[in-house]
């Protein structure tokens, strides 16, 4: 069809409505204004427009912010948001977290896509750093938003935000991420007594050095193999086989069920097997007894 | 079977108001818009607007914004057109029509499918 | 505001073909349909969509729709298809209808 730009007579919008459905992409270029429609952004969600349609609606919007969409814009959305780029995401100044779950609720049930990763580190960036209630917004719609994060990005995390996290979150993270997430989330539930902490820092012991895992097993606290099987395995070598038996209590029986992985394996390997034998679960490969063991790291260390 | 059953035959006096219902039976009353359309005496066919009963969204002819409100009661399926300030020139055969609205064939814009089901229609009389 | 046009009548000898024609500017760009009204009684639509049929309409009637004008085809016309015909567009959220044609089975 060619194209036409004067509007027809007796087309030109006074609202937004759903009549607007029915004009054809010229025609909403033509009648609709742009400045009655930053006003009405709220209507638009509610009115089931065509991508083609909606591509037209960013358009007038566009011309009408070159500079990037004002907040009281943005908030109103809706699906428009998915016909944004990174690059018209990056003109946005976001401050309201009402804006970014208003935004995040568009995507709700999708991946994270790169307009939302831009959005956040937008959000994030403005606000200088990740506090509770966003975090708990960006958990509440991606459960591994903090596993996305680098290590250097997760420094910025207060330990109050650590209360937000719940342990799906921390699923997909990795060592070096445990590694900075675990003192701020044991400085966070420091004043919780033995059980309930344990509750809590569970989820973040991938990240706990050795003497705070022998701290625990002294505090009976029946860690499960999942767990366990989380954990540094330079944190774990260290450790006895009395303090295995002590941290994971009833569920030591599942060593054997993992003893060729890791951490399990490497650590069976350095234990004396007569020590092993004491948990009569059959574990193999331990330091057979009459030998000794030399901790080189030591005699490097002296030397 | 599919059919819009309309109210009875109204007179009212000039400056009044009318309402009239159309309720739907045999499909989903949400599926459908609802145009409402006169005939006067003799006269064409005039087209006075529509709703979706879905979200409630009208649309008027220019002719009769501000004299006609169309509403819906999805629980009864039921729609209704009501004018307000009724002159003489107003008495008219009022029908309901159902009418789909489907995407056109490159997914650019809706537009709406013929009005395939039509009411009784409802003769109102205004006079003094 | 947009408008259609239509002959107010057409007259035919039965078992001829009686054509209506409806006019519009641009009316080939819209979707045009087509009512037939009985005295006393509801329009009923005959043609959707410029040249659809609803199930239990007869396949004498068809119809087409190019340029500036739409038209109404009635083949073999009978007795039973005297009425008032109704053109109809939509132009975009709003519904036209032409003023009607009378068909005359002589």
């Known amino acids: 069809e060619v194209e036409k730009t004067a509007c027809p007579s007796g087309k030109k919008a006074r609202e937004i409505d759903e009549s607007l459905i029915f004009y054809k992409k010229w025609e909403l270029e033509a009648c609709v204004d742009a400045a009655l429609l930053a006003t009405q952004m709220d209507r638009v969600n509610a009115i089931p427009f065509t991508y083609e349609q909606l591509d037209v609606l960013k358009h007038k919007l566009d011309e009408l912010y070159p500079q990037g969409y004002p907040e009281s814009v943005i908030q109103h959305l809706g699906y428009l948001f998915l016909k944004m780029s990174p690059e018209d995401i990056r003109k946005w100044n976001v401050t309201s977290l009402e804006t970014l779950k208003a935004l995040l609720e568009v995507n709700k049930g999708h991946e994270m896509s790169p307009q939302v990763a831009t959005l956040i580190d937008r959000f994030v960036k403005g606000r200088g750093q990740l506090d509770k209630d966003t975090l708990d917004t960006l958990t509440a719609f991606y459960p591994g938003y903090l596993c996305s994060l680098s290590p250097e990005e997760l420094s910025s995390v207060p330990p109050s935000s650590i209360w937000a996290v719940r342990p799906q979150d921390l699923d997909t993270c990795d060592p070096r991420q445990l590694d900075v997430l675990y003192p701020k989330a044991r400085l966070a539930f420091q004043n919780m007594n033995g059980s309930e902490y344990f509750v809590k820092i569970q989820s973040f012991l991938g990240g706990a050095p050795t003497e705070d895992l022998k701290a625990l097993s002294q505090q009976n606290v029946s860690m499960d193999l999942a767990t366990f099987m989380k954990l540094r395995t330079d944190a774990v070598l260290p450790l006895t086989v009395a303090e295995v038996q002590k941290l994971l209590g009833p569920h030591v029986e599942g060593l054997k069920a993992e003893e060729r992985h890791r951490p399990v394996r490497d650590w069976i390997l350095r234990q004396r097997q007569d020590d092993l034998d004491t948990l009569g679960l059959g574990l193999q490969g331990g330091i057979p007894n009459g030998y000794l063991v030399l901790d080189l790291s030591m005699q490097e260390a002296l030397s | 079977q599919v059919q819009l059953v309309q109210s009875g035959a109204e007179v009212k006096k000039p400056g009044a108001s009318v309402k009239v219902s159309c309720k739907a039976s045999?499909?989903?009353?949400?599926?459908?818009?609802i145009h409402w359309v006169r005939q006067a005496p003799g006269q064409c066919l005039e087209w006075m607007g529509w709703?979706?009963?879905?979200?409630?969204?009208?649309h008027y002819a220019q002719k009769f914004q501000g004299r006609v409100t169309m509403t819906r009661d999805t629980s009864i399926s039921t729609a209704y057109m009501e004018l307000s300030r009724l002159r003489s020139d107003d008495t008219a055969v009022y029908y309901c029509?159902?009418?789909?609205?489907?995407?056109?064939?490159?997914?650019?814009?809706?537009?709406?499918?013929?009005?395939?089901?039509w009411g009784q229609g409802t003769t109102v009389t205004v006079s003094s | 505001s947009y408008e259609l046009t239509q002959p107010a009548s057409v007259s035919v000898s039965p078992g001829q073909t009686a054509s209506i024609t409806c006019s519009g500017d641009?009316?080939?760009?819209?979707?045009a349909s087509w009512y037939q009204q009985k005295p006393g009684q509801s329009p009923v639509l005959v043609i959707y969509?410029?040249?659809k049929r609803p199930s239990g309409i007869p396949e004498r009637f068809s119809g087409s729709n190019s340029g500036n004008t739409a038209t109404l085809t009635i083949s073999g016309t009978q007795a039973m298809d005297e009425a008032d015909y109704y053109c109809?567009?939509?132009?975009?959220?709003?519904?036209?209808f032409g003023c009607g044609t009378k068909l005359t089975v002589l």
């Open positions: 045999g499909y989903t009353f949400t599926g459908y818009y």
């Open positions: 709703i979706n009963p879905k979200s409630g969204g009208t």
């Open positions: 029509a159902r009418a789909e609205a489907r995407l056109a064939a490159r997914q650019e814009y809706y537009y709406f499918y013929g009005m395939d089901v």
């Open positions: 641009k009316l080939g760009d819209k979707y």
């Open positions: 109809q567009a939509w132009d975009s959220s709003t519904v036209v």
């Open positions: 969509q410029d040249s």
